[in-house]
């Protein structure tokens, strides 16, 4: 088997759709499988077409985290297997967070993950830097939420509240839709009181470049950059 066209690497924003192409040839026509970070691809759709002993495989992905995607072309001559591999990386571009970029609209929170955490019938800010803000923000929370399953019972509820109120920020009443960031003091309480051990481990891994998952790139606020409740009590949200 021989790969004629390898998938290309992409640097995209969270919530983007990406199509990876892989074209291979051989006698007999090879089969193509896709691997994501060493495992079978868990999500995404695959379309294939075969023409003149050439197989073309297209993997469409909804990007919620960085990853290494490998195209493996395999065919069999008698008892002998022939394999060719080509890989591409998907990285998530740093994006301007809602509190820095107030492009968006306000709507009632219609999701599920943060329903028990947010205020009842919460009106939240949806960031239009995403193609589908509701779906993208919900997916971001959902992905990060799964990582919280391993933290301590003391940390978890505090971290969930911080996560939901950071990604689905309260919408400020006014003529321009504006997100209300979490108050610095509440963020620090989660970081230094409820989740001190977990935060330390996470920051250490991030600094060593071992752990750059989407939760840490996008989901956790930098407490020092948040407004203090002592500056203006209405300028930030209390958890």
């Amino acid at each position: 088997a021989r790969i004629l066209r390898a998938p290309e690497s992409h640097n995209v924003t969270f919530g983007s759709f990406v199509t990876l192409h892989c074209t291979a040839t051989g006698i007999p026509v090879p089969t193509i499988t896709w691997i994501e970070n060493g495992n079978a691809v868990s999500s995404g759709s695959i379309q294939e077409s075969v023409k003149d002993r050439v197989i073309d495989s297209r993997l469409q992905l909804f990007i919620t985290k960085p990853g290494l995607y490998t195209c493996i072309a395999t065919n069999k001559h008698g008892e002998k297997f022939s394999t060719a591999k080509a890989a591409a990386t998907i990285s998530i571009a740093e994006w301007s967070k809602p509190q820095k970029d107030n492009k968006g609209y306000c709507a009632q929170y219609r999701g599920e993950v943060c329903n028990a955490v947010l205020a009842k019938d919460a009106l939240v800010f949806l960031n239009t830097s995403y193609a589908d803000p509701e779906e993208a923000q919900e997916l971001l929370v959902h992905t990060a939420w799964n990582e919280l399953k391993v933290v301590s019972p003391v940390c978890r509820p505090a971290a969930e509240a911080l996560l939901c109120n950071h990604i689905f920020q309260e919408c400020s009443p006014g003529v321009v839709p504006t997100p209300i960031p979490i108050c610095r003091e509440y963020c620090l309480a989660v970081k230094e009181l409820f989740c001190a051990k977990e935060w330390l481990v996470m920051e250490e891994k991030t600094h060593r470049g071992l752990y750059r998952s989407e939760m840490h790139l996008l989901s956790v606020p930098e407490c020092s950059k948040l407004p203090s409740m002592h500056w203006d009590p209405t300028a930030c949200a209390r958890l």
Partner: antibody
Framework: QVHLVQSGAEVKKPGASVKVSCKAS????????MHWVRQAPGQGLEWMGW????????SYAQKFQGRVTMTRDTSISTAYMELSRLISDDTAVYYC???????????WGQGTMVTVSS | SYVLTQPPSVSVAPGQTARITCGGN??????VHWYQQKPGQAPVLVVY???DRPSGIPERFSGSNSGNTATLTISRVEAGDEADYYC???????????FGTGTKVTVL
């Protein structure tokens, strides 16, 4: 100053359609959902549906599904509500309303009287 | 679909307190809003999110919500408070907005 200004009164025959407009000013039109509410003479308020002016997405009350169409023109900050296959029971005042950063409707249009009569 | 029930009418003497109820299944888990509507006019929001008041609405208007009943309270009632009052909620399960049946407040 925040305003919602609606189109004028309409008289329609049964079976016809009516299209009511609602022009927003004084706030970011694409930032907040626009709702439509109607009130038949001597009756209560009835929610018809909403449109997300940013995306054009809509949600309609079951009662009006298939008969109502909500659209918007962001270039002129205007929302529209079209009701088709009119019957005499559709005679009502039609309001557009929005909530600027709260979950309630804190701004309302002045209302448009639609009369359906043969 | 979610139903909100209000008494058709409430009568109150000037200076007294009027209480308007709004009944709904587990309404306490929802945010309740109240509107005042005078004849020939568009509704005006008087209380939102159970008990918050928009700017310009007198402190005489207050709200509460728990269990299966939400209440709008108008203290020291004035003649100008005579109007129809509607409660309203967002029904999350259907993503529909629901109004109560309305209550006519008469100032004696």
């Amino acid at each position: 100053q925040v305003h919602l200004v609606q189109s004028g009164a309409e008289v329609k025959k049964p079976g016809a359609s009516v299209k009511v407009s609602c022009k927003a000013s004084g706030y970011t039109f694409t930032g907040y959902y626009m709702h439509w509410v109607r009130q038949a003479p001597g009756q209560g308020l009835e929610w018809m549906g909403w449109i997300n002016p940013y995306s054009g997405g809509t949600s309609y009350a079951q009662k009006f599904q298939g008969r109502v169409t909500m659209t918007r023109d962001t270039s002129i900050s205007t929302a529209y509500m079209e009701l088709s296959r009119l019957i005499s029971d559709d005679t009502a005042v039609y309001y557009c309303a929005s909530g600027l950063g709260i979950s309630a409707f804190d701004i309302w249009g002045q209302g448009t009287m639609v009369t359906v009569s043969s | 679909s979610y139903v909100l029930t209000q008494p058709p009418s409430v009568s109150v003497a000037p200076g007294q307190t009027a209480r308007i109820t709004c009944g709904g299944n587990n309404i306490g888990s929802k945010s309740v809003h109240w509107y005042q509507q005078k004849p020939g006019q568009a509704p005006v929001l008087v209380v939102y999110d159970d008990s918050d008041r928009p700017s310009g609405i007198p402190e005489r208007f207050s709200g509460s919500n728990s269990g299966n009943t939400a209440t709008l309270t108008i203290s020291r009632v004035e003649a100008g408070d005579e109007a129809d009052y509607y409660c309203q909620v967002w029904d999350r399960s259907s993503d529909h907005y629901v109004f109560g049946t309305g209550t006519k407040v008469t100032v004696l």
